[in-house]
């Protein structure tokens, strides 16, 4: 009775269960009643990451420097190359096929989370008592200057974009 289903790491062909090729190898010849499956290692620039019956290996991903990409992890015969973005850039999508510059947080906003190769800058509005007067991908909101600790008084109130202006206390003559 020919099988209708095969065990794990096997496949059905010509009413027979053949071993799949291990990761890193592709199928060259199916097994027969008398011979094992014949597999061949993928070449240097190729990979297969599962037990398979593929007759061709997949090409490693190319990290295109023109798209701002660089190799984070070199591919092997069993794994694809992992790309990441150059300094100052992050992936446009989860598959990281191209990169875009990190966004800057505008005045009135500070950096909540610095961008990485895979995620953009996260900005947050400066709360009361804090300000940011620059457009930056790194700077957090800074606290207003404390005039009191300098024995000064507030001459001009701070905003989310500007620091307070301190001045000398009015001396009574």
């Amino acid at each position: 009775e020919p099988p209708t289903a095969c065990r794990e790491k096997q496949y059905l062909i010509n009413s027979q269960c053949c071993s799949l090729c291990q990761p890193g190898q592709k199928l060259v010849s199916d097994c027969t009643e008398f011979t094992e499956t014949e597999c061949l290692p993928c070449s240097e620039s190729e990979f297969l990451d599962t037990w398979n019956r593929e007759t061709r290996c997949h090409q490693h991903k190319y990290c295109d420097p023109n798209l701002g990409l660089r190799v984070q992890q070199k591919g092997t015969s069993e794994t694809d190359t992992i790309c990441t973005c150059e300094e100052g850039l992050h992936c446009m999508s989860e598959s990281c096929e191209s990169c875009v510059p990190h966004r800057s947080c505008l005045p009135g906003f500070g950096v909540k989370q610095i961008a990485t190769g895979v995620s953009d800058t996260i900005c947050e509005p400066c709360p009361v008592g804090f300000f940011s007067n620059v457009s930056s991908a790194f700077e957090k909101c800074r606290p207003w200057t404390s005039c009191e600790t300098k024995d000064l008084v507030v001459q001009q109130a701070g905003t989310n974009k500007t620091d307070v202006v301190c001045g000398p206390q009015d001396r009574q003559r």
Epitope: V28, S29, L40, P41, S43
Partner: antibody, heavy 119, light 106 residues
Framework: QVQLQQSGAELVRPGVSVKISCKGS????????IHWVKQSHARRLEWIGA????????TYNQKFKGKATMTVDKSSSTAYMELARLTSEDSAIYYC????????????WGQGTLVTVSA | DIELTQSPAIMSASPGEKVTITCSAS?????MHWFQQKPGTSPKLWIY???NLASGVPVRFSGSGSGTSYSLTISSMEAEDAATYYC?????????FGAGTKLELK
Amino acid sequence: QVQLQQSGAELVRPGVSVKISCKGSGYTFTDHAIHWVKQSHARRLEWIGAISTNYGAATYNQKFKGKATMTVDKSSSTAYMELARLTSEDSAIYYCARRGSHGDWFAYWGQGTLVTVSA
Amino acid sequence: DIELTQSPAIMSASPGEKVTITCSASSSVSYMHWFQQKPGTSPKLWIYSTSNLASGVPVRFSGSGSGTSYSLTISSMEAEDAATYYCHQYHRSPLTFGAGTKLELK
């Protein structure tokens, strides 16, 4: 018994191409890939590549891409390898080989084809 | 590419002498295979999967090793063992061979 019968020696001029053959007998030809191996005068063995006799897909050693082209004729149980733009560096014995019924090793070899490139 | 370095390149041994040929791989491989070749003939499978003798190979031959270091040993050299021996890896593409060890009878 399993036999891989290769074509005879070739004396060719530089710049031309040569096509050598390997006929399989004593087994089902499409059950095994055919590999090609070069043995230069220094006696060094180099794997050129392999071709699936069933699927027809060829796998090349990067070094021989553009130099060697492997093909198969299932009807005559014969594998072919064409070597292009020959130079003296291509003068060598070329073997076809096949693995055994089990395991990844070359159990059967052809008798070799001597290719001599000379003006 | 995985480079296979054989040593020695050439050696001579007297009948009855123990012979060891080594093969070092530039990166780890699962198994090593060995071929014997005599002048004017095709290579012959001699040892497969590191330590298994091919059909008809005398039991004075043995193979061992793992990772990057492998060897072929003849416990007691005989005249018919004079030949060139090649190690071979089928682990990574391109498949590669060692440069060979020519064993001569002293």
